[in-house]
């Protein structure tokens, strides 16, 4: 069996840091046999038999001139076998990011700190950290380690597939070269990494008769699962085309009657999305909408859509009203006390 | 020789912008992760924000968020700070410094002020 | 954020005086501490990585020693050109937080 250690990387090539002292090792022959060194493709012998150094070349202060492949010869000549030497880094501790557009998925992504120059691979595990009483600050032991699925395998993301919004976790990147292993451990709270996507199908239309109402609607983000315990709050902006500075409000629920619309004037409208009870926070803004206030006089009939007033545009105390919205009937999360122990932030 | 400078620093009113630049010589810049450090007028120092190599992972300090932006090209050697809607409290020298890793700075620039003020 | 306290806030010792400066993290950090030097009007430099590790160039009398939450930085022999502000500073985190600084003189 060869005398050289396999690194974690391609056959035939080993492994050395610049300005270190790098040993190749020739794979061929028994440990301790002596043998000459020769750089491929150059007569000049580098290392002798005598050297005392047995099947091993030492390179005082390797540098990116040693870098190459290198020939051992037995005493009689037979080839020992071929080396490639490769110089790099060994690994910093990988820089992680972790975020979740629901309350069940959160996935992580990750970059290297600094660039090693080696083969590199990345190991994910994560462990659940569970709160043992309301009251407690103590944390039961860690359950896991499980995997966490690289998706698709090779990419510099893993995914978390029902993960518990109370929990906290414990992320593990490791980043492996021939050179060793680093490891950053985050630690992550649903809660605050909380990012929903942006809400989907934003429509704006003008109100027939009212030349300074626009009506917006939008609905909840796709990716958003399809139950009424964990709902989305929404934050409207619009402003007048060429008009630097945008409105915000808070509507209460898909849709929004904006009433100080500029006559005439086409509008951009954007809406964004966080949960209800204010974890995380505020989607990316949706694509912007535009729509333009409606300039006809007033309809005799009421829009289909909704009861609006039909006296002439003064600007009425009382909006259209709003479209239902998910029930609030009272569930679990709505009857958590959010106390210090589940206010965990993400520790980055 | 290995070096760091700043560059863009200047008075801005408040509400203003500026663009901090940071040119590297000396070493090869797209392997290390970058940082701006800032130090307000007499005071101690400050991390702002930091970059991977890549440029496609990037950290700030809570003061600055969503008003800085970090930004690098490593055609160009060059690491840059963009800084939005200033405030009286962002005024301080800013250093960029240089990895190894995330968040240990071997090497640092000479610096450039920046005075937000009316 | 991990929070960095450092004792004393300054002091005045002579020269070849041993001086010692700690700095305590408000939670654990393993090694992950950097001490800087930073003189008047210069930008700050690297002394000590990763709680005790000596940055190549830096003179032997600077050391470093500590983990988890409580490390010590200590001059050997303190000299004229060591006065400045010293920072201690985490990255544990992967928002690194200073210390608040220790300005040594000469008495």
């Known amino acids: 069996s060869s005398p050289c250690p396999q690194a974690w990387g391609p056959p035939g090539v080993q492994y050395g840091q610049p300005g270190r002292s790098v040993k190749l090792c020739c794979p061929g022959v028994t440990a301790g046999d002596p043998v000459s060194w020769f750089r491929d493709g150059e007569p000049k012998l580098l290392q002798g038999p005598d050297s005392g150094l047995g099947h091993e070349l030492v390179l005082a202060q390797a540098d990116s001139t040693d870098e190459g492949t290198y020939i051992c010869q037995t005493l009689d000549g037979a080839l020992g076998g071929t080396v490639t030497l490769q110089l790099g880094y060994p690994p910093a501790r990988p820089v992680v990011s972790c975020q979740a557009a629901d309350y069940e998925n959160f996935s992580c992504t990750w970059s290297p700190s600094q660039i090693s120059g080696l083969p590199t691979r990345y190991l994910t595990s994560y462990r659940k950290k569970t709160v043992l009483g309301a009251d407690s600050q103590r944390r039961s032991p860690s359950t896991g380690p499980w995997p966490c699925p690289q998706d698709p395998l090779g990419a510099a993301r893993c995914v978390v597939h029902g993960a518990e919004f109370w929990s906290q976790y414990r992320i593990n990147v490791t980043e492996v070269n021939p050179l060793g292993a680093s490891t950053r451990l985050l630690d992550v709270s649903l809660q605050s990494i909380l990012r929903p996507d942006p809400p989907q199908g934003l429509r704006v239309e003008s109100v027939p008769g009212y030349p300074r109402r626009l009506r917006a609607s939008w609905t909840y983000p796709a990716s958003w699962p399809c139950q009424p315990h964990f709902l989305l709050k929404f934050r409207l902006q619009y402003r007048p085309a060429q008009h630097p500075a945008w409105s915000t409000v808070e509507p209460a629920g898909l849709e929004e009657v904006i009433t100080d619309a500029v006559a005439g004037l086409p509008h951009a409208v954007r809406v964004s999305a966080r949960d209800f009870l204010d974890a995380g926070t505020w989607s990316t803004w949706s694509p912007e909408a535009w729509g333009t206030p409606s300039t006809g006089t007033i309809p005799k009939e009421i829009p289909a859509w909704g009861q609006l007033h039909t006296q002439p545009e003064v600007e009425p105390q009382v909006d259209s009203p709003a479209p239902p919205r998910p029930s609030l009937q009272p569930h679990p999360r709505l009857l958590d006390h959010r106390d210090s122990v589940e206010q965990v932030a993400v520790l980055a | 020789e290995v070096q760091l400078l700043e560059s863009g620093g200047g008075l801005v009113q408040p509400g203003g912008s500026l663009r901090l630049s940071c040119a590297a010589s000396?070493?090869?810049?797209?392997?290390?992760?970058m940082t701006w450090v800032r130090q307000a007028p007499g005071k101690g120092l400050e991390w702002v924000s930091s970059i991977v190599p890549y440029g496609d992972l990037t950290q700030y300090a809570d003061s600055v968020k969503g008003r800085f932006t970090i930004s690098r090209d490593n055609s160009k050697n060059t690491l840059y700070l963009q800084m939005n809607s200033l405030r009286a409290e962002d005024t301080a020298v800013y250093y960029c410094?240089?990895?190894?890793?995330?968040?240990?700075?071997?090497?640092w620039g000479r610096g450039t002020l920046v005075t937000v003020s009316s | 954020d991990i929070q960095m306290t450092q004792s004393p806030s300054s002091l005045s010792a002579s020269v070849g005086d041993r001086v010692t400066i700690t700095c305590q993290a408000s939670?654990?950090?393993?090694?992950?501490l950097n001490w800087y030097q930073q003189k008047p009007g210069k930008a700050p430099k690297l002394l000590i990585y990763d709680a005790s590790n000596l940055q190549t160039g830096v003179p032997s009398r600077f050391s470093g020693s500590g983990s988890g939450t409580d490390f010590t930085f200590t001059i050997s022999s303190l000299q004229p050109e060591d006065i400045a502000t010293y920072y201690c500073q985490q990255h544990e985190s992967q928002s690194p937080t200073f210390g608040p600084g220790t300005k040594v003189d000469i008495k």
């Open positions: 000396g070493f090869t810049f797209s392997v290390y992760s």
């Open positions: 939670q654990d950090i393993n090694n992950y």
């Open positions: 410094a240089k990895g190894p890793g995330w968040g240990s700075f071997d090497l």
